[in-house]
């Protein structure tokens, strides 16, 4: 049965013959418990482990360091996998990151990074990225030179302000940077002119709040 297989990530799940998108259990190196994740087996060849998803505003993303560390929400809907799990997964082997976005007009776009991993908790889950491509802007809306993760109770940004408090959500803020996919969810008609919304600057500008987002990772050698 699927539960008995020691899948490290959704790539392992896919390669074991499970090619249907859905919730699977993975066993991450150095983590004491298995973790349920959503596996996207449809996009760009499949095998993607979803680490973040927003779609309807049903889940509060304005949370503290501990919750962003261990994750919250449900893989069947909106959720954040957890920084500790993201760190552990991306320490297993080399991963790429793909971010799927949709605006309120139904336009879809993506950003993809050839290399993605984050540091450990002592390193404030610092973001490491290389090789940006995609349709969600010529420039990267994630900080390529590295940024620490901040939450409302852990101010690790590069600003005299407190980005996570002002813009809401936990994220790799700079000062405060060109993105925040964990910002406030605003519905259609209310999503313009929002500094604290779900932002991807080089897709829709600095104050447009997006309708849905998915962050997912896959091994480089998939």
């Amino acid at each position: 049965r699927e539960e008995e297989k020691p899948f490290r990530d959704c790539a392992d799940v896919y390669q074991a013959g499970f090619n249907k998108s859905g919730i699977y259990t993975i066993y991450i190196n150095n983590m004491p418990e298995p973790k349920k994740v959503f596996c996207n087996m449809d996009v760009n060849g499949g095998g993607w482990t979803v680490i973040q998803h927003r779609e309807d505003g049903s889940l509060d993303f304005q949370r503290g360091w501990k919750e962003y560390k261990m994750g919250f929400g449900n893989p069947s809907g909106e959720y954040w996998l957890g920084n500790e799990f993201i760190f552990a997964i991306t320490s297993q082997r080399q991963y790429m990151l793909r971010i799927e976005l949709m605006d309120w007009e139904g336009n879809r776009a993506y950003s993809q990074y050839d290399r993605f991993h984050i540091g450990n908790e002592k390193q404030n889950y610092r973001l490491y990225l290389k090789g940006h491509t995609g349709t969600a802007g010529k420039q990267s809306s994630l900080i390529l030179h590295g940024a620490d993760f901040s939450t409302k109770d852990a101010d690790n940004d590069n600003c005299m302000c407190k980005c996570a408090l002002m813009l809401t959500g936990g994220w790799w803020f700079d000062a405060c940077g060109p993105s925040n996919l964990n910002g406030m969810f605003y519905t259609a008609g209310q999503n313009h002119g929002k500094l604290n919304g779900i932002k991807w600057h080089y897709f829709k500008g600095p104050s447009y709040s997006l309708r849905s987002t998915t962050m997912m990772i896959r091994p480089l050698d998939f």
Partner: antibody, heavy 122, light 112 residues
Amino acid sequence: EVQLVQSGGGVVQPGRSLRLSCAASGFTFSSYGMHWVRQAPGKGLEWVSYISSSGSTIYYADSVKGRFTISRDNAKNSLYLQMNSLRAEDTAVYYCARDLLDYDIWTGYGYWGQGTLVTVSS
Amino acid sequence: DIVMTQSPLSLPVTPGEPASISCRSSQSLLHSHGYNYLDWYLQKPGQSPQLLIYLGSNRASGVPDRFSGSGSGTDFTLKISRVEAEDVGVYYCMQGTHWPPTFGQGTKLEIK
């Protein structure tokens, strides 16, 4: 460490020109909107001009419009204020200031230069 | 242009005592973004101004917690819970909701 180091001030006769410079370091200059703010001797603060991170958006105070030109060179991490047709009332300490937030999101001035005195006198 | 009116213009305070500065704007500063674009700056003698409070009530990093900002719309207040000798200087409020940005006249805080 964020630093804004100014130069170019001095004494100049009315009607003449002067160019102020502001050299930035310690941050990604090309990501921030920049401003010039001035302070006449013994007076309060007055906003003068703004330029967006890419240089595509520029604003001036009515008091300097048509006489002053703000510009930036992101490759050199530098901000400039070209002041022409100077008047006695332009006498002030001029400060360059950086937006608190990047990507042209306005929330005020996070960092200020040390100021440079411009004296317009015959 | 938006007129910013501060009071008092001069504020002598005994160390350890509280202090309060008022700032009124000629129009509401509540932006459609949901923020009041109202900052407070302190200019110490012989120095450049420094940011104390942004967006009406948010303390800038490194600013002691004895400083607090409050208010919305047209009325704003900067409070210092216990004044210290290093707090002397001129305090300015500044609005950025309506272009151009405008400053108050300044309030000079001095130690009694």
